[in-house]
């Protein structure tokens, strides 16, 4: 198969990646699965430059990213190392807050209204961003 050389319709290209920005809300797991069905993953933020790009497109709206600690340590969905990687948490976050009354803590990360990150209850229906890679992302043969 050949490599994907341009982004799908309605996706935005930036720095050899393609991004899709939702306009509706889903729980984190449903957003995660939506991206999988698109041969993509929830956005993985690896630099300040990528942070600013995503922030510009989502505006001041709570939006899921591909970062969670549902199995213990914080993990990016594509395997990018969390400990050594880019972070942009709000002050005193993540805090795994239990005071929301919804049961459990907070295991999924999202962009807040100022772009900085917060951990929240994964069931909240936030918008989300899918990301896939150009060049190495796809083996799909071109349409004839």
């Amino acid at each position: 198969g050949s490599e994907r050389t341009c982004c799908p319709v309605n996706w935005v290209e930036h720095e050899r990646s393609c991004y899709w920005f939702s306009r509706s809300g889903k729980a984190w797991a449903d957003a995660d699965n939506y991206c999988r069905l698109e041969d993509a993953h929830l956005v993985v933020v690896t630099s300040w430059e990528e942070q600013k790009f995503v922030q510009h497109h989502i505006g001041p709206v709570n939006t899921w990213m591909g970062l969670h600690d549902q199995n213990g340590p914080w993990k990016w969905v594509d395997g990018t190392d969390y400990e050594t990687g880019f972070k942009n948490w709000r002050p005193e976050q993540p805090d795994d807050w239990y005071g929301h009354g919804l049961g459990g803590g907070e295991d999924c990360a999202h962009f807040t209204d100022d772009g900085r990150w917060n951990d929240d209850v994964c069931q909240r229906p936030y918008r989300w961003v899918c990301e896939t890679e150009l060049d190495k992302a796809s083996q799909e043969p071109p349409l004839l």
Epitope: G1, R4, N33, Y34, C35, R36, L37, E38, D39, A40, H41, W76, V77, D78, G79, T80, T132, E133, K136, A137, S138, Q139, E140
Partner: antibody
């Protein structure tokens, strides 16, 4: 030609461990998600686990979560399944299968090539 | 988890006749964004691994004879063999890839009458 060759099966006592391997050839291994599917004797197919092409994310059936670990070595074109705390109900033929998806960072969940399988028997 | 329910459990069809297998999913497997149904069909003969026949409910895998066809959308799907050949005697499984865990139906055994 795509080839998948499983090995590592055998007889093990309940509570024991086993590591299955799947040697892959004939395609760009690092660009393909891979999966383990099992089939108990005389029964149907059960999806066990999957891993994305770069090895960065894995998925498990509830029946094996916390006991089985899927991994891959892309430099050796090999997929693994480490099986711990084995139970009698884990007895099955274990198939390695290639995901037909187009992305190295996602699992499509449809399997276009399968190995011949390796039999795991858990019995005392 | 999505439960896949085939019907019938088994069927016997004369060679050259049509065989039809149905599969119902407990929830829709249609992804509205791309209008794809995440439903596949596999054939398994005794002592062999499964073989992918159909994916996205109706797309035939490369090399699969055109007597095999898939149809349906949402929760109801059909695999048809237009003219049963002796080599088609096998167990046929439907499988959803819409959500994880991926799940297979129990299978339908097709014999010749």
């Amino acid at each position: 030609e795509v080839q998948l060759l499983e090995s590592g099966g055998g007889l093990v006592q309940p509570g024991g461990s086993l590591r299955l391997s799947c040697a892959a050839s004939g395609f760009t291994f690092s660009s393909s998600a891979m999966t383990w599917v099992r089939q108990a004797p005389g029964k149907g197919l059960e999806w066990v686990s999957a891993i994305i092409g770069n090895g960065g994310r894995a998925y498990y059936a509830d029946s094996v979560k916390g006991r089985f670990t899927i991994s891959r070595d892309n430099s050796k074109n090999t997929l693994y399944l480490q099986m711990n705390s084995l139970r009698t109900e884990d007895t099955a033929v274990y198939y390695c299968a290639k995901d037909r998806g187009y992305s190295r960072i996602a699992v499509a969940g449809t399997f276009d090539y399968w190995g011949q399988g390796t039999l795991v028997t858990v019995s005392s | 988890d999505i439960v896949m329910t085939p019907s019938p459990d088994s069927l016997a069809v004369s060679l050259g006749e049509r065989a039809t297998i149905n599969c119902k999913s407990s929830q829709s497997v249609l992804h509205s964004s791309n209008n794809k149904n995440y439903l596949a069909w596999y054939q398994q003969k005794p002592g062999q691994p499964p073989k992918l026949l159909i994916y996205w409910a109706s797309t035939r895998e490369s090399g699969v004879p055109d007597r095999f066809s898939g149809s349906g959308s949402g929760t109801d799907f059909t695999l048809s063999i237009s003219s049963l050949q002796a080599e088609d005697v096998a167990v046929y499984y439907c499988q959803q890839s819409y959500t994880i865990p991926f799940t297979f139906g129990p299978g339908t055994k097709v014999d010749n009458k």
